[in-house]
Amino acid sequence: YDFTNCDFEKIKAAYLSTISKDLITYMSGTKSTEFNNTVSCSNRPHCLTEIQSLTFNPTAGCASLAKEMFAMKTKAALAIWCPGYSETQINATQAMKKRRKRKVTTNKCLEQVSQLQGLWRRFNRPLLKQQ
């Protein structure tokens, strides 16, 4: 999906009002310095591409993020504020329904959510020069 036509300010508002709090809740008990940010993004569409990938694509050691509250709300924000996003999600949703497993918060998942927090922070500051 091409995130170029999303309403970035509305997605930012959704992040600030609710998604950010859910990410903090997920990470509670973890030191903010525990993980290094290794994933970056260069502009808002790129940030959303990376956020979608990290939130919804299962990775080795962390297959369960898609059912977390922050993920559900991220999906809702993209569905509402990115024209046509919903229609692209049919395969992803069907795959998610097949993967209904017991939730396990692994260290790898915590690291992945830490990366997500960094991507969202970057999304909220699009005019900053890339480090």
Epitope: M72, I80, C82, P83, E87, Q89, I90
Partner: antibody
């Protein structure tokens, strides 16, 4: 276009709670993107909330809970501490950018002692 | 919350008339403004989104205009099936809010 089918009419006592369901079909999207709107008899449309519009309209704050189950494509709206003024038709609705182009048929909730 | 004020609250018109309904926002909302039509016992129907875009399947006699705080819904030639209540809705502020409605009745 997405079809939204709501649960049936309810009659509730003051002080109790009601939970209305809304099942989506005919399209793939996040049930977490569904919004809830109500309409009291002879009155206008009143926005209640959606899962990412966390700032529910002030008058509902603390009384309304909106949830969803993606695995069954069903959204839920629960309203607690019901009073007679909550008698209304409750609609679930969906639309990109909150331009609500898909609506449920409505669920009449009557609050009466 | 952003307040939406519609005027008039009701109007009487004849088939073929040009009808104009206005909606004013309590603060600037850009073009985050939608219009709905509702008939008794039915769910609302989206007519116009983003202030001026016609929803698919809606007759071209309906049009919307405006930006900032002042918006207009126009029905160029009123048809029998257009007698209904019309609502504006802003989606810029959180939560989105509706106007109080304008009832279009037969003269």
């Amino acid at each position: 276009q997405v079809q939204l089918v709501q649960s049936g009419a309810e009659v509730k006592k003051p002080g109790s709670s009601v939970k209305v369901s809304c099942k989506a079909s005919g399209g793939t999207f996040s049930t977490y993107a569904i919004s809830w709107v109500r309409q009291a008899p002879g009155q206008g449309l009143e926005w209640m909330g959606g899962i990412i519009s966390i700032n529910y309209a002030q008058k509902f704050q603390g009384r309304v809970t909106i949830t969803a189950d993606e695995s069954t494509s069903t959204a839920y709206m629960e309203l607690s501490s019901l009073r007679s003024e909550d008698t209304a038709v409750y609609y679930c609705a969906w639309g990109a950018k909150y331009a609500l182009d898909s609506w449920g048929q409505g669920t009449l909730v009557t609050v009466s002692s | 919350d952003i307040q939406m004020t519609q005027s008039p609250s009701s109007l009487s018109a004849s088939v073929g008339d040009r009808v104009t309904i206005t909606c004013r926002a309590s603060q600037t909302i850009g073009t985050y403004l939608n219009w709905y039509q509702q008939k008794p016992g039915k769910a609302p129907k989206l007519l116009i989104y983003s202030a001026s875009s016609l929803q698919s399947g809606v007759p071209s006699r309906f049009s919307g205009s405006g930006s900032g705080t002042d918006f207009t819904l126009t029905i160029s030639s009123l048809q029998p099936e257009d007698f209904a209540t019309y609502y504006c809705q802003q989606t810029d502020g959180n939560p989105p809010t509706f106007g109080q409605g304008t009832k279009v009745e037969i003269k």
